[in-house]
């Protein structure tokens, strides 16, 4: 068979699998006269032999790990042993078989990890080697955790990067590891060759001992700082510490205060920089941040709480420059005249703001001094000695000392002596009749004017009239405002009227004075009036309990799952029927009676989340009024979209023949949600048969480079299958095809004779 197993002397390359006993010749070289014999030199290793007649063969199994390429030379000799042709290079490439097991560099590894370390951040690497060809699956290693001890609640705290051997914490490990509970863990790690994919793979194991160290980056206890400190500032009040020295500390004032009286030094000590004033601000909450030397936060900020402790630095203050009270001239001893309420800005319910009252002067002292007394702690003024007479002294002025434990303040009180309250208010009408209103009458509307008169001294508490509704309005839907000059009462709507709960209300008003009546005088029927409020029905639409209902479900919930519910009530008490509007994707159905919402089709976050529909509540019977509310269904992502190419890559070409290995870059994407750092795709060739011609290498989480391994490509289109794995839970893989054409080029573009197939590649490499 000329060509495959025999032929003339020329440079040739042969590929032979290692480990196989010789079963056939490599090549039969044909001699061209005057050549009669052949000679073999080079890296024969006493394995390769050429017979004088030109038969090249090998006499025992090859070992790629000893020599992966044998560079031989064959020369043709004449009858005198003189080289007449060659020597020509003959290359024997030894192809790999999986005849070596992976071995860990260490039988035991030790490492430490800090509690609350960032998930996925490597803290230890295990490393194995395999003498087989790393460009083939035989030398491609796959690491996994066989067991974690102890295993608490079946939760893995550690994870390993299958390719690099990097060990890091899982999210659960980051949250739950605690050296106080479990200071050490042991992992058994396995490594397999064949990328872990074959039953025939070799493996090895190693042990990893992990110490969990305490995370000292913790919020300190709340600090109490006394206000108005006279000590030299700054004063250290607390501290934070990163787990290593050299962190760059800063404070963040979330409240954006005009003055922020705290600082932090490079050791993490926190200071108050100036005296604090509790009355200005009684507590501060701010954050301590630790950054690395590159300016990146090392961890979450810590919340610092500072409570400002009160000192007695505020005197009592009077409620007004002069406080005015009235007293009737025949009031009895002990009657209350009024209460002086002074204030103190110091902390409530402490000795610093606890006030004492004392009368220090009365003018005039007629008919005698000491006519009034004040309750020491309550500030209530009382008549102490006798009744007063308006014609003798119509007005008294008191000076009252108000004191806390350190300060004294003088307050001034004016007491006006007024006529006795011996006249009661009298309504001009005892019955204001019936009033009919629709239940939707506006709040704030005045619906009735009432009037009573009082013959006591004008513009005093004895003649002033206050109106109260004492019956018929337990819901407090109505109120009465009084005009202080005319004592006219205006009845207003304070809350919505409601036919359904109060169609008819029999309202009773009472007219009273703020001043007490003299002994023996009582309010009688003249001080009472009534009216009847009739509320007419307005048919109202059902009312939803919320404007927007929101629910959250995973996008992969089973059909028929309850995903939410809505509730509405009809003011008239009619039954309600629920329906959906705007369910454009046909994903949902609603139970007409209960308002429960169910999925009726597969949900898909990638089609849009939240999914917004309207829910309609309609009266059953009556005038069938309806209301509309929103239902927003937030779909939580599951990894249900395999990676794909980010764009159309038709038209990729290399100019043939290749002068050097070439490469092209492609981008992958998928439609799932990628929080924080974006996708983390891994790339590999889609089938083993591509390994000899192509290589794919990751650039970052979304981009990879496809490179040729050699330059010996035919002038045709190659379809390169690429496997893209998203590393999700569960991991999804997409197999995509990149069509790459090797073509003759004219001025850097593919040349196609006229009439050749369409679809000319347009992207040169």
């Amino acid at each position: 068979q000329e060509g495959k197993f025999s032929g003339p002397l020329k440079p040739m390359t042969f590929s032979i699998y290692e480990g196989q006993e010789p079963s056939q010749i490599i090549f039969q070289f044909k001699a061209n006269p005057p050549a009669v014999t052949f000679e073999l030199t080079g890296e024969t290793d006493n394995i390769f032999v050429i017979e004088r007649e030109g038969l090249l063969y090998y006499n025992r199994a090859l070992d790629r790990e000893t020599r992966s390429t044998h560079n031989l030379q064959v020369a043709a000799l004449d009858a005198n042993g003189i080289i007449v042709e060659g020597p020509v290079p003959i290359t024997i490439k030894v192809k790999d078989i999986n005849d070596n097991r992976p071995t860990f560099l260490q039988s035991k590894y030790e490492g430490s990890v800090r509690q609350n370390s960032r998930p996925g951040k490597p803290f230890l690497y295990v490393n194995a080697t395999d003498l087989d060809d790393p460009a083939t699956p035989n030398g491609q290693l796959y690491y996994q955790i066989v067991i974690q001890l102890p295993m608490i609640n079946n939760v893995m705290y550690f994870q390993i990067n299958n390719k690099t051997g990097a060990i890091s914490l899982t999210r659960e490990g980051s949250q739950e590891l605690n050296p106080a509970k479990n200071p050490s863990y042991n992992l058994v790690i396995s490594v397999k060759d064949m990328g872990g994919q074959s039953e025939n793979s070799f493996s090895d194991t190693t042990s990893v001992d992990i110490i969990v160290t305490e995370n000292i980056w913790k919020a300190p206890k709340p600090v109490e700082m006394v206000e108005n400190s006279t000590d030299p500032h700054p004063i250290k009040i607390t501290q934070v510490r990163w787990n290593d020295p050299g962190a760059q500390y800063s404070l963040v004032d979330k409240e954006k205060l005009p003055r922020f009286p705290f600082s932090i030094d490079q050791e993490g000590d926190i200071y108050v920089t100036q005296p604090l004033d509790r009355e200005e601000k009684d507590a501060y909450v701010f954050y301590a941040v630790a950054k690395d030397e590159y300016g990146k936060p090392l961890s979450y900020p810590l919340e610092i709480h500072v409570k400002v402790k009160d000192i007695n630095d505020n005197p009592p203050t009077c409620p007004s420059p002069v406080t005015v009270f009235e007293v009737q001239e025949n009031e009895r001893l002990g009657n209350s005249i009024g209460t002086l309420t002074a204030h103190d800005r110091d902390e409530e319910n402490t000795a610093n703001s606890f006030l004492n009252y004392r009368i220090v002067e009365q003018t005039p002292k007629l008919p005698m001094d000491g006519l009034f007394l004040i309750q020491t702690y309550a500030g209530m003024l009382q008549l102490a000695k006798q009744s007063l007479k308006k014609q003798d002294t119509p007005q008294y002025n008191l000076t009252i000392e108000v004191s806390d434990k350190d300060f004294k303040t003088l307050c001034f009180v004016q007491i006006n002596v007024i006529d006795i309250n011996d006249q009661i208010p009298i309504f001009e009408k005892s019955d204001y009749g019936n009033l009919t209103l629709a239940e939707d009458t506006n709040i704030g509307s005045t619906i009735l004017t009432i009037q009573a008169t009082d013959a006591d001294e004008p513009f005093t508490g004895s003649s002033k009239i206050l109106y109260h509704i004492i019956k018929g309005d337990s819901e407090g839907r109505l109120g009465v405002d009084t005009d202080p000059h005319t004592n006219t009462g205006y009845v207003i709507i304070k809350k919505p009227l409601d036919f359904e709960t109060a169609a008819v209300s029999n309202i009773v008003f009472k007219a009273e004075n703020p001043e007490p009546l003299v002994f023996g005088v009582k309010y009688n029927a003249s001080s009472f009036a009534k009216f009847t409020l009739i509320v007419t029905d307005v048919n109202e639409a059902p009312q939803f309990s919320q404007h927007v209902f929101q629910a959250k479900v995973s996008e992969d919930v089973a059909i028929g799952t309850k995903v939410g519910n809505v509730t509405a009530k009809d003011p008239e008490g009619l039954d309600i029927s629920y329906s959906l509007r705007g369910d454009t994707r046909g994903w949902l159905k609603i139970d007409h009676v209960t308002g429960e919402i169910f999925s009726v089709a597969p949900l898909d976050r990638e089609a849009g989340s939240p999914y917004r529909v309207q829910v309609v509540a309609t009266e059953v019977g009556g005038s069938s009024l309806s209301s509309v509310s929103e239902f927003h269904l937030i779909l939580m992502d599951v990894n249900d979209n395999p990676p794909r190419l980010a764009k159309d890559y038709t038209g990729l070409f290399f100019c043939h023949p290749l002068s050097a290995p070439g490469s092209l870059i492609f981008e992958a994407t998928d439609d799932d949600q990628h929080l924080f750092r974006g996708p983390h795709f891994t790339f590999s060739l889609g089938s083993g048969s591509l390994q000899n011609d192509w290589e794919v290498s990751k650039i970052n989480g979304t981009h990879a480079r496809l490179s040729t391994r050699h330059t010996e490509f035919e002038e045709r289109e190659y379809v390169v299958l690429i496997r893209i794995n998203d590393g999700g839970r569960p991991p999804l893989e997409g197999i995509v095809s990149l069509p790459v054409t090797f073509c003759s080029c004219v001025e850097g573009s593919c040349f196609r004779p006229a009439g050749h197939q369409t679809g000319i590649p347009t992207v040169g490499m």
């Epitope: 490597p122 020295p245 590159y294």
Partner: antibody, heavy 119, light 112 residues
Framework: AVQLQQSGPELLKPGASVKISCKAS????????MHWVKQSHGKSLEWIGG????????SYNETFKDKATLTVDKSSNTAYMELRSLTSEDSAVYYC????????????WGQGTSVTVSS | DIVMSQSPSSLTVSVGEKVTMSCKSS????????????LAWYQQKPGQSPKLLIS???TRESGVPDRFTGSGSGTDFTLTISSVKAEDLADYYC????????FGGGTKLEIK
């Protein structure tokens, strides 16, 4: 095995700039920070600065802030240091060295790049 | 900045002898929050780049012979070679990594 392969020696004129490279292999480039150290002939070591390859954040010795600029190219696992406005004082061997994130020593060093500044 | 001082600047010993070299820092390198000392020792043989010998003041790196011992606390540190071999001819540098990084001036070890 971890390797830090630095670019070759440089002979430059005063006032020139130079960019030396350090190609990392045998480990995950973004899992370690890369630092640069100067050693003048017969002298001790001086820390110049470091860079976080993940996002390019830098940290400099104040002495070198106006002299050196550190950058990385994640796609080629290579760190660079550019030295500007060169004088004879800048003649030295410059080393790159990796440090795990945090406060750790320099566990692997490049072979060094000799920079000679001469008119 | 933390300043590191080494002494002596050079010393000459015979093979088999014990040698100690000193390193002082201008401030304590002990971080009280975790009780770690942020000091390393490096060996630089002629024509080579520095090699990490000891971290955390006393932890030998893997592959470093046990004749090398680091000790000290706070501000005063010592590197001891219990029985010098010819291959130990090198410059030895201490370095703090407590805040940024600074090296000592070095100690040149020569063999008689």
């Amino acid at each position: 095995a971890v390797q830090l392969q630095q670019s070759g020696p440089e002979l430059l004129k005063p006032g020139a700039s130079v960019k030396i490279s350090c190609k990392a292999s045998g480990y995950t480039f973004t899992d370690y920070t890369m630092h640069w150290v100067k050693q003048s002939h017969g002298k001790s070591l001086e820390w110049i600065g470091g860079i976080n390859p993940n996002y390019g954040g830098t940290s400099y010795n104040e002495t070198f802030k106006d002299k050196a600029t550190l950058t990385v190219d994640k796609s080629s696992n290579t760190a660079y240091m550019e030295l500007r406005s060169l004088t004879s004082e800048d003649s030295a061997v410059y080393y790159c060295a990796r440090i795990p994130y945090g406060s750790y020593p320099m566990d692997y060093w490049g072979q060094g790049t000799s920079v000679t500044v001469s008119s | 900045d933390i300043v590191m001082s080494q002494s002596p600047s050079s010393l000459t010993v015979s093979v088999g002898e014990k040698v100690t070299m000193s390193c002082k820092s201008s401030q304590s390198l002990l971080y009280s929050s975790n009780q770690k000392i942020y000091l390393a020792w490096y060996q630089q043989k002629p024509g080579q780049s520095p090699k990490l010998l000891i971290s955390w003041a006393s932890t030998r790196e893997s592959g470093v012979p046990d004749r090398f011992t680091g000790s000290g606390s706070g501000t005063d540190f010592t590197l001891t070679i219990s029985s010098v071999k010819a291959e130990d001819l090198a410059d030895y540098y201490c370095q703090q990594y407590y805040r940024y990084r600074t090296f000592g001036g070095g100690t040149k070890l020569e063999i008689k």
